[in-house]
Amino acid sequence: EQAPGTAPCSRGSSWSADLDKCMDCASCRARPHSDFCLGCAAAPPAPFRLLWP
């Protein structure tokens, strides 16, 4: 997830200063030191699921 209102990027992406465009935050898992990863916020917690026997 990206930080709130990451301009001018859509949800799940962050602006790259070097490329001057939005990049997918998912790629930060493989390349965490890319510049735009600074703008990718912590992933939201997984939704709670009730486990039935």
């Epitope: 990206q2 930080a3 709130p4 209102g5 990451t6 301009a7 962050s14 602006w15 200063a17 070097d18 001057d20 930060c28 965490p32 030191h33 890319s34 510049d35 990863c37 600074l38 703008g39 990718c40 916020a41 912590a42 992933a43």
Partner: antibody, heavy 120, light 103 residues
């Protein structure tokens, strides 16, 4: 209200270590990158390090790489800077700051600053 | 990032024009104001957008390697040091600063 409160500065001998802390309140800490910036006496601003909201991405100025470590404890809403192998030239006021990705990585909230003096 | 001039001596009511030049092309730039004994304050982000609560006498412009901060009419509280800042190659960098002083 949104604020950053710093602690941990002081006098340390060359080669010594120190850990700075920055406690955040008034905003969703995990949603923001954070940074450390320093200012030597009578000098300009120098960026030191930055970390993403998750803590998974870290960035350092060449002058501190390998000596300083930035980290964050998101459940405690706290940012840290572990400073090792300190040198006289690390003497400065250290500021923590919130980095706004939606402000194209401008820093919009700053701590009050804490003085680190490296001297024998 | 190279800022010029190092010091600008002006009177209240005058226009201040501060320059920031990058060695390589920069896509966006921020500007900060700092007064003695205080933390910096964000004025301009994304080259030309004013941060929250910043009066409209402050404006930013520029592209590529040349950027400008303009204060249209200096107020007494505007006399301070101003820094530009970029983010490039995964490094945040500040300019050396411009001091705006009362002549």
């Amino acid at each position: 209200q949104v604020q950053l409160v710093q602690s941990g500065g002081g006098l340390v001998k060359p080669g010594g270590s120190l850990r700075l802390s920055c406690a955040a309140s008034g905003f969703t800490f995990t949603s923001y990158a954070m940074s450390w910036v320093r200012q030597a006496p009578g000098k300009g601003l120098e960026w030191v390090s930055a970390i993403s909201g998750s803590g998974g991405s870290t960035y350092y100025a060449d002058s501190v790489k390998g000596r300083f470590t930035i980290s964050r404890d998101n459940p405690k809403n706290t940012l840290y800077l572990q400073m090792n192998s300190l040198r006289a030239e690390d003497t400065a006021v250290y500021y923590c700051a919130r980095v706004r990705a939606n402000y194209y990585y401008g820093m919009d909230v700053w701590g009050q600053g804490t003085l680190v003096t490296v001297s024998s | 990032l190279t800022q010029s001039p190092g010091t600008l001596s002006l009177s209240p009511g005058e226009r201040a024009t501060l320059s920031c030049r990058a060695s390589q092309s920069v896509s966006r730039l921020a500007w900060y104001q700092q007064k003695p004994g205080q933390a910096p304050r964000l004025l301009i982000y994304g080259t030309s957008s004013r941060a929250t609560g910043i009066p409209d006498r402050f404006s930013g412009s520029g592209s590529g390697t040349d950027f400008t901060l303009t204060i249209s009419r200096l107020e007494p509280e505007d006399f301070a040091v101003y820094y530009c800042q970029q983010f490039r190659n995964s490094l945040l960098t500040f300019g050396g600063g411009t001091k705006v002083e009362i002549t």
